[in-house]
C-alpha cells in the first residue's frame, strides 16, 4: 500500500512540476524591468525566452517575438534548450509512469516490468527537474551579470537590441515558477525511484517441500530462487509481502520542504 501511495504521489508531484516547467517556459516574465531607480515609469518592460513585451500605463501591451535565431545570445539559446529538454524528458517520463502505476492493470504486466518502468520514469523526472533548475539558474545568473554591467548604450543581450537608455532587468515571476516546478519534478522523480525499490520482487522464497520418489529416499530442498530485477542483487533475506508492498527494512522517504527565495 505504501509503495502505491509513494508511486502515486511521485507521479502527481511530477505532473504538477512538469506543468509548472511548461508554464515557466511559455511565460513572458523571465526578466522584468527593475523599477528601483524609476518607480514612476509609465512604461514597463518585461522579457521571456521567446518574446519581449512592453506594458504601457494606459493598459496597452505590445509583445514582439525574437524573430532571429542566430542573433540571439548563446546563453538564451542554452536556456531554451535546457527547458525544452526538461519538458520532453518530463513528458516521456509521465507517459512511462502512467503504465508503471501499480493501480493500473495492463494485461499481465509483471511487477518487475513495472518496477523497471517506475525507475525509468523516476530518472527521467530527476533529469527533467535538473534541466529546468539549471535553465532557470543560468538565466538568473545572466540577469545578475547584466544588472551590474548595465550602463547607457550597452548591449544587454536580450533580443539583440542595443540599449540607449539604462534599463536594468531583475528576476521575473517565471524564474520562481521554474525553480519551484523543477524542484517538484525532482522530488517526484526521487519518490518514483523509492517506489521502484518496493515494487521489485527482489527475492522469492519458496517453502521447502519434501518429494518422496518411490524407491528413493531423497529429499528435494530447493534454495531461495532470486527473481532478477535488473537493479542489482540484494542478499538480505526479506519477508514476503503480497502485491510487492514495502519491506520492513525500507524507510519511507517524504519530500522535504524547500524555501525558494
Amino acid at each position: 500500500m505504501a509503495v502505491t501511495a509513494c508511486q502515486g504521489l511521485g507521479f502527481v508531484v511530477s505532473l504538477i512540476g512538469i506543468a509548472g516547467i511548461i508554464a515557466a517556459t511559455c511565460m513572458d516574465q523571465w526578466s522584468t524591468q527593475d523599477l528601483y531607480n524609476n518607480p514612476v515609469t509609465a512604461v514597463f518592460n518585461y522579457q521571456g525566452l521567446w518574446r519581449s513585451c512592453v506594458r504601457e500605463s494606459s493598459g496597452f501591451t505590445e509583445c514582439r517575438g525574437y524573430f532571429t535565431l542566430l542573433g540571439l545570445p548563446a546563453m538564451l539559446q542554452a536556456v531554451r534548450a535546457l527547458m525544452i529538454v526538461g519538458i520532453v524528458l518530463g513528458a516521456i517520463g509521465l507517459l512511462v509512469s502512467i503504465f508503471a502505476l501499480k493501480c493500473i492493470r495492463i494485461g499481465s504486466m509483471e511487477d518487475s516490468a513495472k518496477a523497471n518502468m517506475t525507475l525509468t520514469s523516476g530518472i527521467m523526472f530527476i533529469v527533467s527537474g535538473l534541466c529546468a533548475i539549471a535553465g532557470v539558474s543560468v538565466f538568473a545568473n545572466m540577469l545578475v551579470t547584466n544588472f551590474w554591467m548595465s550602463t547607457a548604450n550597452m548591449y544587454t543581450g536580450m533580443g539583440g537590441m542595443v540599449q540607449t537608455v539604462q534599463t536594468r532587468y531583475t528576476f521575473g515571476a517565471a524564474l520562481f515558477v521554474g525553480w519551484v516546478a523543477g524542484g517538484l519534478t525532482l522530488i517526484g522523480g526521487v519518490m518514483m525511484c523509492i517506489a521502484c525499490r518496493g515494487l521489485a520482487p527482489e527475492e522469492t522464497n519458496y517453502k521447502a517441500v519434501s518429494y518422496h520418489a518411490s524407491g528413493h529416499s531423497v529429499a528435494y530442498k530447493p534454495g531461495g530462487f532470486k527473481a532478477s530485477t535488473g537493479f542489482g542483487s540484494n542478499t538480505k533475506n526479506k519477508k514476503i509481502y503480497d502485491g510487492g508492498a514495502r519491506t520492513e527494512d525500507e524507510v519511507q522517504s517524504y519530500p522535504s520542504k524547500h524555501d525558494y527565495v
Epitope: 524591468q33 524609476n38 514612476v40 515609469t41 509609465a42 512604461v43 518592460n45 518585461y46 522579457q47 519581449s52 513585451c53 512592453v54 504601457e56 500605463s57 494606459s58 493598459g59 496597452f60 505590445e62 514582439r64 537590441m161 540599449q163 540607449t164 537608455v165 534599463t167
Partner: antibody, heavy 118, light 113 residues
Framework: QVQLVQSGAEVKKPGASVKVSCKAS????????MNWVKQAPGQGLEWIGQ????????KYNGNFKGRVTITADTSASTAYMELSSLRSEDTAVYFC???????????WGQGTLVTVSS | DIVMTQSPDSLAVSLGERATINCKSS????????????LTWYQQKPGQPPKLLIY???TRDSGVPDRFSGSGSGTDFTLTISSLQAEDVAVYYC?????????FGGGTKVEIK
Amino acid sequence: QVQLVQSGAEVKKPGASVKVSCKASGYAFSNYWMNWVKQAPGQGLEWIGQIYPGNGDTKYNGNFKGRVTITADTSASTAYMELSSLRSEDTAVYFCARYYRGNCFDYWGQGTLVTVSS
Amino acid sequence: DIVMTQSPDSLAVSLGERATINCKSSQSLLNSGNQKNYLTWYQQKPGQPPKLLIYWASTRDSGVPDRFSGSGSGTDFTLTISSLQAEDVAVYYCQNAYTYPLTFGGGTKVEIK
C-alpha cells in the same frame, strides 16, 4: 462615437471645494483610464491625475496630491474630479481626457471653467 | 519630474511654407524595450480642447493630415508642418508620456505671417 461631456462652469469662493463631472459614451468606460488636465488662463497644460474606473485605481500629480480626489461611477459612466481648499490660482479650465495607446490622450472633454473669486 | 522645453514660444510662417517646432526633454523618452519614444504632440485651437496629433514621437493619429510629421529620439524632438494651412493656426504642445507625472511643454503658438 467616443464623447466626453463635462459639467458646466463653476464660480467658487477661496477655501471651498468644487466637483467637476465627465460623462463618457461610445466606448467601454471601465476599460480605459480617465485623466484630468488643468489649463490656467493663457497658460499651458498641467496633468492632475487619472483613474481606472474598472477597479478605482488612481494616480496623482504630486502638485495636487492631498487637495484633489478623482472618483468614477461605472454605472453612470462618469468620472469626477473634486478639488478642495480652493485658491485663486486654481482658476482654470479643467479637461477630462481618455488615456490611450502610447500613453496619450486621444479624446478630450470640452472643458469646465472653474473660477475662484472672493 | 521630466521638464519639457518647447521652442520657439511663437512662430509666424507664410501659408504653404514649412513650420518647425522643437521640443526638448530633461530625460530620454526612448524606451529600450520597444525602441519607441514616448512623446506626444497636441494641437489646441482657441476655445477648444487639445487634439491628439502624433504619439510615439512619429505615429500620426487617425484623421491627422500627412502634412504633420514628428521626428526625433531620446531627448530632442521636432514637429513639422510641411505646408502650413490657415486651419493650422493653433498652439502646439509636446507631452512626456514616459514617466509620471505626465508633463507638457509650454506650448508653441503658430501664426500666419
